[in-house]
């Protein structure tokens, strides 16, 4: 029959060429002379001329070696025609299958593969995957089936086989325990890919395994003991820099130190921070230290890392002996602000109080005193005893210097240290009121009509405090009572002045004597303008002119 089975031709055939493959034959050749031809890619279309046919015999010819990796299968058509060119058979399909030879080595997709794995992991942990390709056939043959293996490992520490590779997938895994970044930060593996499922051609590449840091090393103090000297009272003073070493990766959370004062800081006097570059612990004073109270502090500082330890590790502790240095401290007034009650107007030379300071220093230093600020110049202070005496009249009613009955004075104490130091204190004199002011009417000028006059109400003020104020009493003197009356209201804080007889238009002096509850008397002259008018007036009208 006019059919042909698929033809298998191995690639890379060595000839000789042309090579006979198969014979096309039509049974119509009994009747007539038959001429054979082939068409299709590989015959009369690109790649042309790979195959040919002997026109009269029908032998299918291969003209050159085949390459399966270029073309794995050719599909041609066979034709049979008579002498006159008429087709005697339908075109016949000819399949030529190129069979594989192992003519390609595996190729790794990269020359160098890079992967990483955390130090200290267990065997079985995957690290990375490598890949090699092989152009040969891996479906019907083993020519293109790649098997992976590890040829060598550098360094060979702690074991010469720290890793293994899945022969089919190329996945590299940890096989041995003991990956330690601090000893071996990187491994270089020479990996092999071998075709024929491990029995053929081999190619190599490099796999670099970076060992990643885990916090498996504790920071250690070096040294562990420190001695420091700090002046007393200094706040924010750098006491000591503590140094640690940590084998983990620098500037990582596994390396960065965290410091904690574990003991010896009962008064919460110290604080410790981490220097961002050096990783040192910077111990500073949070509060001032007091030499007189405690001249030595022994601190215990523990160091850990920002990152938690991945396993149980012993923590390092440092001991810091802090010697507090004595400083000449300023005298301190006791109390810093002293309130003293004193009567206003006490005689000059009269003692007001004693106001002294204490020196925190243990030596018996001499303290001298002086007044630093005495706005009214009312006081003096004994430089030795701190005795404050009056040298001027203390006036409670002096609004320039006294606020809310209090006169404020600043005093200074100075020790005889080298150099001397000073301290200040505030003396708050609460001035006790004395009845030294009489009542005063307001206003002191009035305008009143001489016909049907309106009563004039005057407010009474007294600079003193109760009980040296209302109720007040009023009395007219110097014959003012002939024309005027003066009466204090029921509350006793105003006086009503009335014109009781006709006075011609003019200005008059009304002599009004007011006394307070303590009988302090004050005479005031009221200037009264009497106008020719009726009832209420504020200013006298001008003279009337008729028309």
């Amino acid at each position: 029959d006019w059919v042909v089975a698929p033809i298998s031709v191995p690639e890379n055939g060595k000839g000789p060429f042309p090579q006979r493959l198969n014979q096309l034959k039509s049974n119509k050749d009994r009747d007539t002379k038959i001429f054979y031809s082939i068409t299709g890619p590989g015959a009369d279309s690109p790649p042309e001329g790979v195959f040919a046919v002997e026109k009269e015999t029908g032998w299918l010819l291969l003209n050159k070696p085949l390459d399966r990796e270029e073309i794995a299968k050719y599909e041609l058509f066979g034709h049979a025609v008579s002498e006159n060119g008429a087709s005697v058979e339908d075109p016949m399909n000819i399949s030529i299958i190129v069979t594989d030879q192992n003519d390609h080595k595996p190729k790794f997709t990269q020359d160098t593969f890079r992967g990483s794995v955390l130090e200290g992991v267990l065997p079985g942990t995957s690290v990375m995957q490598v890949t090699a390709t092989d152009e040969d056939d891996a479906i019907y043959t083993y020519n293109g089936v790649v098997a992976y293996s590890i040829h060598s490992q550098e360094p060979k520490d702690p074991h010469d086989l720290m890793f293994t590779i899945h022969r089919s997938t190329g996945t590299i895994s940890v096989i041995s325990s003991g990956l330690d970044r601090e000893k071996v930060p990187e491994y270089t593996l020479t990996i092999q890919a071998t075709d024929m499922d491990g029995d053929g051609s081999t190619t190599t590449a490099v796999a670099v395994v970076e060992i990643l840091d885990a916090n498996d090393n504790a920071p250690m103090f070096d040294p562990q003991k420190y001695e420091a000297h700090v002046p007393e009272n200094a706040v924010g003073h750098e006491v000591q820099r503590l140094t640690v070493t940590d084998l983990d990766a620098p500037n990582s959370p596994a390396w960065r130190a965290t410091y904690l004062i574990m003991g010896g800081d009962d008064g919460d006097h110290f604080t410790i921070t981490t220097h961002p570059e050096s990783n040192q612990g910077i111990l500073t004073t949070r509060k001032g230290l007091d030499f007189e109270a405690k001249n030595q502090h022994t601190l215990y500082v523990e160091v850990t890392n920002e990152a938690p330890f991945v396993l149980k590790l012993p923590t390092s502790t440092a001991t810091i002996v802090v010697h507090v240095e004595d400083v000449n401290e300023a005298p301190v007034f006791v109390p810093p602000s002293k309130v003293v009650e004193v009567q206003e107007g006490i005689p000059t030379g009269e003692p007001v109080c004693v106001y002294t300071a204490e020196d925190p220093d243990k030596e018996n230093q001499k303290i001298s005193y002086r007044i630093l600020r005495d706005p009214a110049g009312w006081l003096a202070m004994d430089p030795d005893s701190g005795q404050v005496t009056a040298v001027g009249t203390l006036d409670r009613e002096d609004e320039q210097f006294v606020r809310n009955n209090i006169y404020e004075v600043m005093v200074l104490a100075m020790d005889n240290g080298s150099p001397p130091t000073t301290g200040t204190g505030t003396l708050l004199l609460t001035l006790i009121d004395v009845n030294d002011h009489g009542p005063v009417p307001e206003p002191r000028q009035i305008t009143i009509c001489n016909q049907s006059p309106v009563r004039q109400v005057l407010n009474i003020t007294d600079k003193d405090l109760s009980p040296h104020t209302s109720p007040f009493q009023a009395q007219l003197t110097d014959d003012s009572d002939i024309y005027w009356t003066a009466e204090v209201n029921e509350e006793g804080d105003t006086v009503v002045l009335s014109l009781k007889k006709f006075l011609k238009q003019d200005t008059y002096d009304v002599h009004l004597s007011l006394s307070d509850h303590g009988n302090k008397e004050q005479l005031t002259v009221i200037r009264a303008t009497v106008c020719d008018c009726h009832g209420h007036v504020e200013t006298c009208p001008g003279p009337w002119k008729g028309g």
Epitope: G120, L122, H166, S168, S173, S177, D180
Partner: antibody, heavy 117, light 111 residues
Framework: EVQLLESGGGLVQPGGSLRLSCAAS????????MSWVRQAPGKGLEWVSA????????YYADSVKGRFTISRDNSKNTLYLQMNSLRAEDTAVYYC??????????WGQGTMVTVSS | QSALTQPASVSGSPGQSITISCTGT?????????VSWYQQHPGKAPKLILS???KRPSGVSNRFSGSKSGNTASLSISGLQAEDEADYYC???????????FGGGTKLTVL
């Protein structure tokens, strides 16, 4: 001589706890991953748990996950297995073994754990 | 159900040779050359007799040998002796957190 010696086995009620120890000698203990492998009476070997040389990494079989805790103290050359919420099916001889890099060697002599009411 | 499959039992007469198979998958036995074999006498702890498919630790008789083909590993014992009667377990490395697999064990009887 390389040696592993287990202790701590015994009879315990279901739901109870037990702590096994394995003392190592004759080799650099901290350089090796260690495992616990158990064998129920008349049955085969079953891997239970593993811990890395540093102690920073651990594995557990699904059957014991959440109930057993493996740990080690390299300063004492000792491996531990804390077993909580014990069940009847945990009854077995428990062996500690050192991972040699693809195989277990050596093995301890084993300690018997019986979970029964 | 064990991860690796072994015959439950094999037997042989003294002087004979026997082979115990251990079948896994392409992700364990087939993937790595880390098949090991352990011998366990009754009441005793397992003892390593072969590592890395065919490597004998010192002190192990050369009558024990190992091989691997595809996903199946084999333990061969030649010149069978009475003291070889024991249980034999194969084991294979596999990646992941179930990093080691055991076979169900094979009871060897020396007739």
């Amino acid at each position: 001589e390389v040696q592993l010696l287990e202790s701590g086995g015994g009879l315990v009620q279901p739901g109870g706890s037990l702590r096994l120890s394995c003392a190592a000698s004759g080799f650099t203990f901290s350089s090796y991953a260690m495992s616990w492998v158990r064998q129920a009476p008349g049955k085969g070997l079953e891997w239970v748990s593993a811990i890395s040389g540093s102690g920073g990494s651990t594995y557990y079989a699904d059957s014991v996950k959440g109930r057993f805790t493996i740990s080690r103290d390299n300063s004492k050359n000792t491996l531990y297995l804390q077993m909580n919420s014990l069940r009847a099916e945990d009854t077995a001889v428990y062996y500690c073994a050192s991972w040699g890099g693809g195989w277990f060697d050596p093995w301890g002599q084993g300690t018997m754990v019986t979970v029964s009411s | 159900q064990s991860a690796l499959t072994q015959p439950a039992s094999v037997s042989g007469s003294p002087g004979q040779s026997i082979t115990i198979s251990c079948t896994g998958t392409s992700n364990d036995v087939g993937a790595y050359n880390y098949v090991s074999w352990y011998q366990q006498h009754p009441g005793k702890a397992p003892k390593l007799i072969l590592s890395e498919v065919n490597k004998r630790p010192s002190g192990v008789s050369n009558r024990f040998s190992g091989s691997k083909s595809g996903n199946t590993a084999s333990l061969s014992i030649s010149g069978l002796q009475a003291e070889d009667e024991a249980d034999y377990y194969c084991s294979s490395f596999t990646s992941g957190d179930h990093w080691v697999l055991f076979g169900g064990g094979t009871k060897l009887t020396v007739l």
